[in-house]
C-alpha cells in the first residue's frame, strides 16, 4: 500500500508470522506507531509495535501463534493498519487488505550440514523452517557458493526447481575453504519473494592425494 511518500509492505511466513515494514518520509522518529491485524473471519486480532530500522522506516513482527501453527489459510484476508499516536488519539497512517498466501516470504533454510565431502565435490543438505504443509513439494530453492577471493554478489546462482533439500556441488578445488548459502520460495503467490539467505555453511574440500594427478 503506497500513499504519497508512505510505503507499507508485509509478508507472511506461511505459518504464524506476518512481518511488516512501514516507511514514511518526514515522519517523526519518536512517534509511537503500531501495526494492527484484523482477519476477516477469525475471532482474534493482533498488534505489534513498530520499531525504527532506519531514518524513515519502521518494522515489526505480528506473532500470530506458536511458530509451526497454521494460523491463516489460503482464503483469509487480513486488514492491516498502521496506527500512530497523536497526543491522546490514534491516527491511521496506512491500510491494506492483505492476502497472506499472495504475499509470502518463508523463513531462511536451517540446519545446513555437510553430508559428504571429497576433493572436488561436496554434498550439502538443509531443512526448511516453519513452512506450511500447504505447499506440498511445490517449492524452489536458490543456492550459491562463495569461493576464495570472491564476494557473495559475484557467486553464480544455482536453481533447484523442486523441493530438493540437498545439493551436490561439483568441480571444486581441492584443499580449499568455501562457504555455502541457500534460500527458498514457494510457487504460490503473486507478490511472493525469496526467503532471506540461510546462515553460511563453511566447509573445506579434501586435499588431493599426494603423488596423484588431480
Amino acid at each position: 500500500a503506497v500513499n504519497g511518500t508512505s510505503r507499507f509492505t508485509c509478508f507472511y511466513n506461511s505459518r504464524a508470522n506476518i512481518s511488516c515494514v512501514w516507511s514514511q518520509d518526514g515522519a517523526l522518529q519518536d512517534t509511537s506507531c503500531q501495526v494492527h491485524a484484523w482477519p476477516d473471519r477469525r475471532r482474534w486480532n493482533q498488534t505489534c509495535e513498530l520499531l525504527p530500522v532506519s531514518q524513515a522506516s519502521w518494522a515489526c513482527n505480528l506473532i500470530l501463534g506458536t511458530p509451526d501453527s497454521q494460523k491463516l489459510t489460503a482464503v483469509d484476508i487480513v486488514t492491516l493498519r498502521v496506527m500512530c499516536r497523536e497526543g491522546v488519539r490514534w491516527r491511521m497512517m496506512a491500510i491494506q487488505d492483505f492476502k497472506p498466501f499472495e504475499n509470502l516470504r518463508l523463513m531462511a533454510p536451517i540446519s545446513l550440514q555437510v553430508v559428504h565431502v571429497e576433493t572436488h565435490r561436496c554434498n550439502i543438505s538443509w531443512k526448511i523452517s516453519q513452512a506450511s504443509h500447504y505447499f506440498e513439494r511445490h517449492l524452489e530453492f536458490e543456492a550459491r557458493t562463495l569461493s576464495p577471493g570472491h564476494t557473495w554478489e559475484e557467486a553464480p546462482l544455482m536453481t533447484l526447481k523442486q523441493k530438493q533439500e540437498w545439493i551436490c556441488l561439483e568441480t571444486l578445488t581441492p584443499d580449499t575453504q568455501y562457504e555455502f548459502q541457500v534460500r527458498v520460495k514457494p510457487l504460490q503467490g503473486e507478490f511472493t519473494t525469496w526467503s532471506p539467505w540461510s546462515q553460511p555453511l563453511a566447509f573445506r574440500t579434501k586435499p588431493a592425494a599426494l603423488g596423484k594427478d588431480t
Partner: antibody
Framework: EVQLVQSGAEVKKPGATVKISCKVS????????MHWVQQAPGKGLEWMGW????????EYAPGFQDRVTITADTSTDTAYMELSSLRSEDTAVYYC??????????WGQGTTVTVSS | EIVMTQSPATLSVSPGERATLSCRAS??????LHWYQQKPGQAPRLLII???QSISGIPARFSGSRSGTEFTLTISSLQSEDFAVYFC?????????FGQGTKLEIK
C-alpha cells in the same frame, strides 16, 4: 505410491443423507488437505470444500456449506464427506482429492451417488 | 464467484498436430490457474499449475501460457492418449471454480 480409495456407489431417496469415505495411503495424512469435488452431469466440476487434517479446520464452498460436512479420522487415514437433504440435482460423481488449497494433486476414483424417489 | 470460460467446447485435431485450448477468467486472477485432463470413466489428472509450471511426470509436449486473464494450454504434437476433456481451474478467489471443459477429439 499415493492412493485414494473411495467407498462404493450409493442410491438415495430425496431428503436423505449420504456419507462417502476416502481411505488414503502412500503419504502422511496428517500433513494433508483433503478436498471433495462434485461432478454432476449438467454442471461440470464443483469444489465442495476441504479439511486440513493437521488441525481439523474446514472450508466449505458457499453453494454447499449448509448441507455438507467434511471430517477426517487420522487414526485410520480416512476422510469423509456427508451431504444432507439430498435432491435429484445432487446426482453426481463425488471425488476426494489431496492437494494444497490451490489445486488437486491426486484424486480418488470417484463415487457415484444417485438420488431418486 | 469467478467464472472460467473455456473455448472451444470441442476441438477436432489430427494425431501429431498441435492443439491450442483457451481459458478466460471473468476477472484478474494473476497466475492462479491450473489445468487438468480427464479421460472417460476416470478422475481428472493435474497437468499444469500456476499457468505454466509442469507437474513432474507430465510429458513435455504439454505447456501453458498466460496473457492477462487469458490462459492457453498447448499440446505440441498430439498422441492418441491425449484425446480427452481438459479443464482449467482458478484459485485466486474462494470458491475456486472450474471451466466447463474442452473436449479434444480425433479429427
Amino acid at each position: 505410491e499415493v492412493q485414494l480409495v473411495q467407498s462404493g456407489a450409493e442410491v438415495k431417496k430425496p431428503g436423505a443423507t449420504v456419507k462417502i469415505s476416502c481411505k488414503v495411503s502412500g503419504f502422511n495424512f496428517k500433513d494433508s488437505l483433503m478436498h471433495w469435488v462434485q461432478q454432476a452431469p449438467g454442471k461440470g466440476l464443483e469444489w465442495m470444500g476441504w479439511i486440513d487434517s493437521e488441525n481439523g479446520e474446514t472450508e466449505y464452498a458457499p453453494g454447499f456449506q449448509d448441507r455438507v460436512t467434511i471430517t477426517a479420522d487420522t487414526s485410520t487415514d480416512t476422510a469423509y464427506m456427508e451431504l444432507s437433504s439430498l435432491r435429484s440435482e445432487d446426482t453426481a460423481v463425488y471425488y476426494c482429492a489431496r492437494g494444497g488449497p490451490w489445486f488437486l494433486s491426486y484424486w480418488g476414483q470417484g463415487t457415484t451417488v444417485t438420488v431418486s424417489s | 464467484e469467478i467464472v472460467m470460460t473455456q473455448s472451444p467446447a470441442t476441438l477436432s485435431v489430427s494425431p501429431g498436430e498441435r492443439a491450442t485450448l483457451s481459458c478466460r477468467a471473468s476477472q484478474i486472477i494473476s497466475n492462479n490457474l491450473h489445468w487438468y485432463q480427464q479421460k472417460p470413466g476416470q478422475a481428472p489428472r493435474l497437468l499444469i499449475i500456476y499457468g505454466l509450471q509442469s507437474i513432474s511426470g507430465i510429458p513435455a509436449r504439454f505447456s501453458g501460457s498466460r496473457s492477462g486473464t487469458e490462459f492457453t494450454l498447448t499440446i505440441s504434437s498430439l498422441q492418441s492418449e491425449d484425446f480427452a476433456v481438459y479443464f482449467c481451474q482458478q484459485s485466486n478467489n474462494w470458491p475456486y471454480t472450474f471451466g466447463q471443459g474442452t473436449k479434444l477429439e480425433i479429427k
